[in-house]
């Protein structure tokens, strides 16, 4: 099941996804795709990073945070109703079946009023993040602005899946830890 995020037509949408690099610059490849996460990779890739930089992006999709510190949250500029749907954030930790994948549901609502769309640079207040602490603790809600509709049970389920993953084995080598968007 997916965590749900909301935005209005004409706004910028924010879909959070995080990991903690072993050290600054020791990046893990990440891909964002439109549609639920497939078995491997991302389908309909809209943005991707490699171990050094953003290596693929498409119009209106960008990383607002510091991806070199593991903030790979996706911003979609000036959304339309067509942007509604499931998005996949996949943290591509090297190894067999080692990726961490998160499905985030974006719901676009018609604008209440229709002023000229404004580009917003500080998305944290408008779209508060849902995190788990290193993928293990209970979900923490930052109640800044209007909260997206988030099911805490779903967050806990995702956290449990993280605990079940093979990530722990990779920590010896890369030190990467995951936090849920």
């Amino acid at each position: 099941s997916e965590v749900e995020y909301r935005a209005e037509v004409g706004q910028n949408a924010y879909l959070p996804c995080f990991y903690t690099p072993a050290a600054p610059g020791n990046l893990v490849p990440v891909c964002w795709g439109k549609g639920a996460c497939p078995v491997f990779e991302c389908g309909n890739v809209v943005l991707a990073t490699d171990e050094r930089d953003v290596n693929y992006w498409t119009s209106r999709y960008w990383l607002n945070g510091d991806f070199r510190k593991g903030d790979v949250s996706l911003t979609i500029e000036n959304v339309t109703l067509a942007d509604s749907g499931i998005y996949c954030c996949r943290i591509q930790i090297p190894g067999i079946m080692n990726d961490e994948k998160f499905n985030l549901k974006l719901v676009i609502k018609p604008a209440k009023v229709t002023p000229a769309p404004t580009r917003q640079r500080d998305f944290t207040a408008a779209f508060p993040r849902m995190l788990t602490t290193r993928g293990h603790g209970p979900a923490e809600t930052q109640t800044l602005g209007s909260l997206p509709d988030i099911n805490l049970t779903q967050i806990s389920t995702l956290a449990n899946e993280l605990r079940d993953s093979r990530l722990a084995n990779d920590l010896r080598d890369s030190g990467a830890t995951i936090r849920i968007g």
Epitope: P21, A22, A23, N26, L27, V28, P29, V39, F40, E41, E51, Q92, I93, P94, G95, I96, M97, N98, D99, N160, E161, D164, S165, R166, L167, N169, D170, R172, D173, S174, A176
Partner: antibody, heavy 118, light 113 residues
Framework: QVQLQQSGGGLVQPGGSLRLSCAAS????????MSWVRQAPGKGLEWVSG????????YNADSVKGRFTISRDNSKNTLFLQMNSLRAEDTAVYYC???????????WGQGTLVTVSS | EIVMTQSPDSLAVSLGERATINCKSS????????????LAWYQQKPGQPPKLLIY???TRESGVPNRFSGSGSGTDFTLTISSLQAEDVAVYYC?????????FGQGTKVEIK
């Protein structure tokens, strides 16, 4: 020592089903991801399916997606592969394999032959 | 998915001579954060399951004779048998475990000349 004992292979008609089992001993199954790898007669190795230690995450090759299901019973230290809608091209020796730390296959079962033919 | 290509397909070497098998990946399997190449080598004798020989490109599995060695980085890798013995007759496979589905080379058959 680590052992993987396989069973369940045999001859089946196209469209039929089989269930392979892999009984593990010498290690705690729930601590490791596991996989099935197959080898068609006279051919190379092809990864088929994998499962996380808890059984919460499963992965399948495109060639078997929607037809094969990997599962495990950690209480019985046993790995399974349920194969449905079998095709002639599924004919192969199937190996269960233990995955060391998300990386390589460090132990393999003895293999079991699955023949799909009318 | 990452495609692994081995060469040659078969190799005939005299006893005591060196055998060299090459493996090329369609993309790099080197993870710069830990400077490890996610590549393993397996040996398969007729009628037997594969046996892990080498992992992380060059680390020998316990019990594997030191005449087996692995080298390479990025996309190009080599398995070397320094002095071929009769019991080394087998098919050898490389395998990447860097990303996507784990994939194997097509295999190299080593025989005695």
């Amino acid at each position: 020592q680590v052992q993987l004992q396989q069973s369940g292979g045999g001859l089946v008609q196209p469209g039929g089903s089989l269930r392979l089992s892999c009984a593990a001993s010498g290690f705690t199954l729930s601590s490791y991801a596991m996989s099935w790898v197959r080898q068609a007669p006279g051919k190379g190795l092809e990864w088929v399916s994998g499962i996380s230690g808890s059984g919460g995450s499963t992965y399948n090759a495109d060639s078997v997606k929607g037809r094969f299901t990997i599962s495990r019973d950690n209480s019985k230290n046993t790995l399974f592969l349920q194969m449905n809608s079998l095709r002639a091209e599924d004919t192969a020796v199937y190996y269960c394999a233990k995955i060391f730390g998300s990386y390589y296959f460090d132990y393999w079962g003895q293999g079991t032959l699955v023949t799909v033919s009318s | 998915e990452i495609v692994m290509t081995q060469s040659p397909d078969s190799l005939a070497v005299s006893l005591g001579e060196r055998a060299t098998i090459n493996c090329k990946s369609s993309q790099s399997v080197l993870y710069s954060s830990n400077n490890k190449n996610y590549l393993a080598w397996y040996q398969q004798k007729p009628g037997q399951p594969p046996k892990l020989l080498i992992y992380w490109t060059s680390t020998r599995e316990s019990g594997v004779p030191n005449r087996f060695s692995g080298s390479g980085s990025g996309t190009d890798f080599t398995l070397t048998i320094s002095s071929l013995q009769a019991e080394d007759v087998a098919v050898y496979y490389c395998q990447q475990y860097y990303s996507g589905p784990p994939t194997f080379g097509q295999g190299t058959k080593v025989e005695i000349k």
